[in-house]
């Protein structure tokens, strides 16, 4: 049996940060499980992982250098992403993986979500002119 | 039987602009087919047909507005895409139909391509200073 | 010569069902999608429903999602309309037409049309 | 859905007349716009296709022009086989759907 996930088609990163809501059709209240985040088509850069633990405080890691925070839900986890560039700009699908109780429970493959980094395109200041001669 | 289609992952166009080319395991040579490019998870928007016949010219239009052109090779078509806004940066899927002869034939989905429209994001002029005063 | 030819228009009571042909000649069947469009007396033009025999892939109207039934078969060269639960107001001249499947926007060629008369 | 609105429903002219019928669409279709003509107890014919193209057999008299949401279609010079009613239809998007008619009548 696998759990299925729900994400946002598309989301857009004005000020290069993003809140990715994964939604699941399980209950991971008194679960230990590992909820993740992959970046690009083939899911090749796992973006950051939150651990959750029935007995202990929520963990949340990139081993990917992504500056990265999450948020429980009963049936969801958000992935709170900043610092983002615009070369980022990617497919991100969730993932989740029930450890225990047993048996071991995954999500079927998601559609993704497209992040789209417009970030903040600065232009540089005009040189100061100083002050004009008489 | 479905056909197979390739595409590369994420293409970037700098200058709004970008070719994207679907591969295919099957041969167009001498078949009346209709190739297609899907803009969003869902392909909701058809971007570009590609009407294909042995006894007429390759016919290329888009009914949503985009501005495309169509390349054919033996197994592949490319999509030359121009004006694209940066907003339209998505997931693009292509899909492959033949008419002619029977069987009717299509593709399998593919992963899609990421096209990032980076656009180009012009700094005003910093105002001519004019001559300096002796 | 490329020739559409309806045939199963009748008179029927509200409720009851009929079922419409609509047969192709002259020209590669998958090539192209049929389509049925209505005409109610004195009035305009209402697409009904579409196939493309291909893949079997079909759309309809809402005015008849659910009671009405598009199919082709492709040995026969001929497209179907299955009508059920008809009412009052689906009361028309029923015409067959075909618009290509590689270059879809326009109806070129089109059927003599038969009638349907839903009355008590 | 989008809605197409004909004007006028319904106009009368002389053979020899320069007629136009107009077709607003709800929202923009590019040039995704045909035109046909029927005559009583008869199917629709196909005069113009993608807003400005003629069917092939259709008189030159006859010419379409427009883009976007705003459409026209022109019969030079009205001859006796042209009193008939003209329908317009939107190609862009499912469900296709036709304008309500213009009827030319003889004055």
């Known amino acids: 049996n696998k759990i299925l996930v729900k994400q946002s088609p598309m989301l857009v990163a004005y000020d290069n940060a993003v809140n990715l809501s994964c939604k699941y059709s399980y209950n991971l209240f008194s679960r230990e499980f590992r909820a993740s985040l992959h970046k690009g088509l083939d899911s090749a850069v796992e973006v950051c992982v939150v651990y959750g633990n029935y007995s202990q405080q929520l963990q949340v890691y990139s081993k990917t250098g992504f500056n990265c925070d999450g948020k429980l839900g009963n049936e969801s986890v958000t992935f709170y992403l900043q610092n983002l560039y615009v070369n980022q700009t990617d497919i991100y699908f969730c993932k989740i993986e029930v450890m225990y109780p047993p048996p071991y429970l995954d999500n079927e493959k998601s559609n993704g979500t497209i992040i789209h980094v417009k970030g903040k395109h600065l232009c540089p200041s005009p040189l100061f002119p100083g002050p004009s001669k008489p | 039987n479905k056909i197979l289609v390739k595409q590369s992952p994420m293409l970037v166009a700098y200058d709004n602009a970008v070719n994207l080319s679907c591969k295919y395991s099957y041969n167009l040579f001498s078949r009346e087919f209709r190739a297609s490019l899907h803009k969003g998870l869902d392909s909701a928007v058809e971007v570009c047909v590609v009407y294909g016949n042995y006894s007429q010219q390759l016919q290329v239009y888009s009914k949503t507005g985009f501005n495309c052109d169509g390349k054919l090779g033996n197994e592949s078509v490319t999509f030359y895409l121009q004006n694209l806004y940066v907003n339209q940066t998505d997931i693009y899927f292509c899909k492959i139909e033949v008419m002619y002869p029977p069987p009717y034939l299509d593709n399998e989905k593919s992963n899609g391509t990421i096209i990032h429209v980076k656009g180009k994001h012009l700094c005003p002029s910093p105002l001519f200073p004019g001559p300096s005063k002796p | 010569e490329v020739q559409l030819v309806e045939s199963g228009g009748g008179l029927v009571q509200p409720g009851g069902s009929l079922r419409l042909s609509c047969a192709a000649s002259g020209f590669t069947f998958t090539s192209y999608y049929i389509h049925w469009v209505r005409q109610a007396p004195g009035k305009g033009l209402e697409w009904v429903a579409s196939i493309y025999p291909g893949n079997v892939a079909t759309r309809y109207a809402d005015s008849v999602k659910g009671r009405f039934t598009i199919s082709a078969d492709t040995s026969k060269n001929t497209a179907y309309l299955q009508m059920n639960s008809l009412r009052a107001e689906d009361t028309a001249v029923y015409y067959c037409?075909?618009?290509?499947?590689?270059?879809?926007?326009?109806?070129?060629?089109w059927g003599q049309g038969t009638t349907v008369t839903v009355s008590s | 859905d989008i809605q197409m609105t004909q004007s006028p429903s319904s106009l009368s002219a002389s053979v020899g007349d320069r007629v136009t019928i107009t077709c607003h669409a709800s929202?923009?279709?590019?040039?995704?716009l045909n035109w046909y003509q029927q005559k009583p107890g008869k199917a629709p014919k196909l005069l113009i296709y993608?807003?400005?193209n003629l069917h092939t057999g259709v008189p030159s008299r006859f010419s379409g022009s427009g883009s976007g949401t705003d459409f026209t279609l022109t019969i030079s010079s009205l001859q006796p086989e042209d009193f008939a009613t003209y329908y317009c239809q939107q190609g862009q998007t499912y469900p296709y759907t036709f304008g309500g008619g213009t009827k030319v009548e003889i004055k």
């Open positions: 929202q923009n279709i590019y040039v995704w």
């Open positions: 037409t075909r618009s290509h499947y590689g270059l879809d926007w326009n109806f070129d060629v």
């Open positions: 993608k807003a400005s």
